[in-house]
Amino acid sequence: AGVFELQIHSFGPGPGPGAPRSPCSARLPCRLFFRVCLKPGLSEEAAESPCALGAALSARGPVYTEQPGAPAPDLPLPDGLLQVPFRDAWPGTFSFIIETWREELGDQIGGPAWSLLARVAGRRRLAAGGPWARDIQRAGAWELRFSYRARCEPPAVGTACTRLCRPRSAPSRCGPGLRPCAPLEDECEAPLVCRAGCSPEHGFCEQPGECRCLEGWTGPLCTVPVSTSSCLSPRGPSSATTGCLVPGPGPCDGNPCANGGSCSETPRSFECTCPRGFYGLRCEVSGVTCADGPCFNGGLCVGGADPDSAYICHCPPGFQGSNCEKRVDRCSLQPCRNGGLCLDLGHALRCRCRAGFAGPRCEHDLDDCAGRACANGGTCVEGGGAHRCSCALGFGGRDCRERADPCAARPCAHGGRCYAHFSGLVCACAPGYMGARCEFPVHPDGASALPAAPPGLRPGDPQRYL
């Protein structure tokens, strides 16, 4: 759980010619307020789709009356932050809509009238707990400047607010695979316990008790593989009962990308690759020059001195897209070890480890031989997230604690009788055979296939196997 916070810095005419008329007049004084709508991941930004992450409305700003003949200045703003609480994990990537509304305070019958003045939308990557991020968005001739951040509510911490901090049980260190909770170094990360039975390979959880499935798996415990063979189309929402993908409309149907942008489907929605000079979720924003600062994340803008000439953003390492707006997927390098699931949270990489492994890159084998003893002289052998004991003669079981029956495998050949002995086993051979396991026949002429028996031992005598 946590809170997304939005601070509006200014709303007024954007740079360049064609300054907008003031939204208020002496005859119709007005005041502004703002609405923010948040959606997780790569959601479509249609205003009518639900704000799945939450929404908030600001207070009303001071009353403003236009001064005749003066250009529209930055308009007076409401005080305070817009706060959108979120109950579950912070998704890392989110879509936003910020609307600027005008409340007219004239002599309208039935009270004030509201009208939408501007709407800006975007998609951003943001780690919870990070610093304020600054942004500038334009809607027509208007420009909105704002900052935003996401912060976790205790006891949640981390870039997704999914780690829980608890006071340490021991003063010196945290448990295996768990780290101190920065900045609360006197507390420890609490282990995340998924729903009982949740598949460790195909499921994960962001909140205790839940079980969320990786792509290709379904069912309440993520144990049902999604089968597309019996389906009409490999698209659409998953049915937990059949494990089948139900046909549905594709997000790129009808190409939602404007101005020649090309559409590609993503797991949750769609993504537009925009031609130079255009950006926005649907490539709807145009007429941009380097003076507008179109390159995000420290990208260097080249060319584009006027709206008719294209600009090019040279992105710093780690960012891509025509406006350096997309972060490179570092998980493609598969940094998580031992089959761990990689999550790129923007400010950090995170690995969800398979059962039996822990550590920031799942590099620690929890079931290894460290601290495990094999009894009765056995030696521990590691491998594959488990350990086993190689037991000394006469012992068996997982930890070599069980006394083995050396005769169970019927080691004496040619009908020899087996006797358990404190140092192993003894074979009493049938007439005509000799050797530790009665494996050698005694030749009829009295000579054996072996060198002569040791002095004092006749063929047929029990031979101790030491």
Epitope: R330, L333, Q334, P335, P360, R361
Partner: nanobody, 114 residues
């Protein structure tokens, strides 16, 4: 602090070859995963488990290799095509103390003429 120093690259005719190298330097660090990116996409690399990995578009043409010290990687690029033209960035997931950090090289321009 770890630095990734890139070398190689340049201008070549289609069908030609180039070799890129990347060396990590610093103190008290170990490399977990290391590879090459272009235009935001992974080209080739060594995963955290030490396995080589390649983008489909370069399989059979590019070969990634590790130096003896395991803190250097080289990318041998054969049968180059004009669409391989890009700035190539070396990237590494580095363990320093108990934490992991991601580092990028300075970038190397590769230009393939038709």
């Amino acid at each position: 602090q770890v630095q990734l120093q890139q070398s190689g690259g340049g201008l070549v005719q289609a069908g030609g070859s180039l070799r890129l190298s990347c060396a990590a330097s610093g103190s008290d660090f170990s490399i977990n995963a290391m590879g090459w990116y272009r235009q935001g996409e992974l080209v080739a690399g060594f995963t955290g488990d030490g396995n080589p990995i390649y983008a489909d578009s370069v399989k059979g043409r590019f070969t990634i290799s590790r130096g003896n010290a395991e803190n250097t990687v080289s990318l041998q690029m054969n049968s180059l095509k004009p669409e391989d033209t890009a700035v190539y960035y070396c990237a590494a997931d580095v363990k320093i103390g108990g934490d992991y950090e991601w580092y990028w090289g300075q970038g190397t321009q590769v230009t393939v003429k038709p």
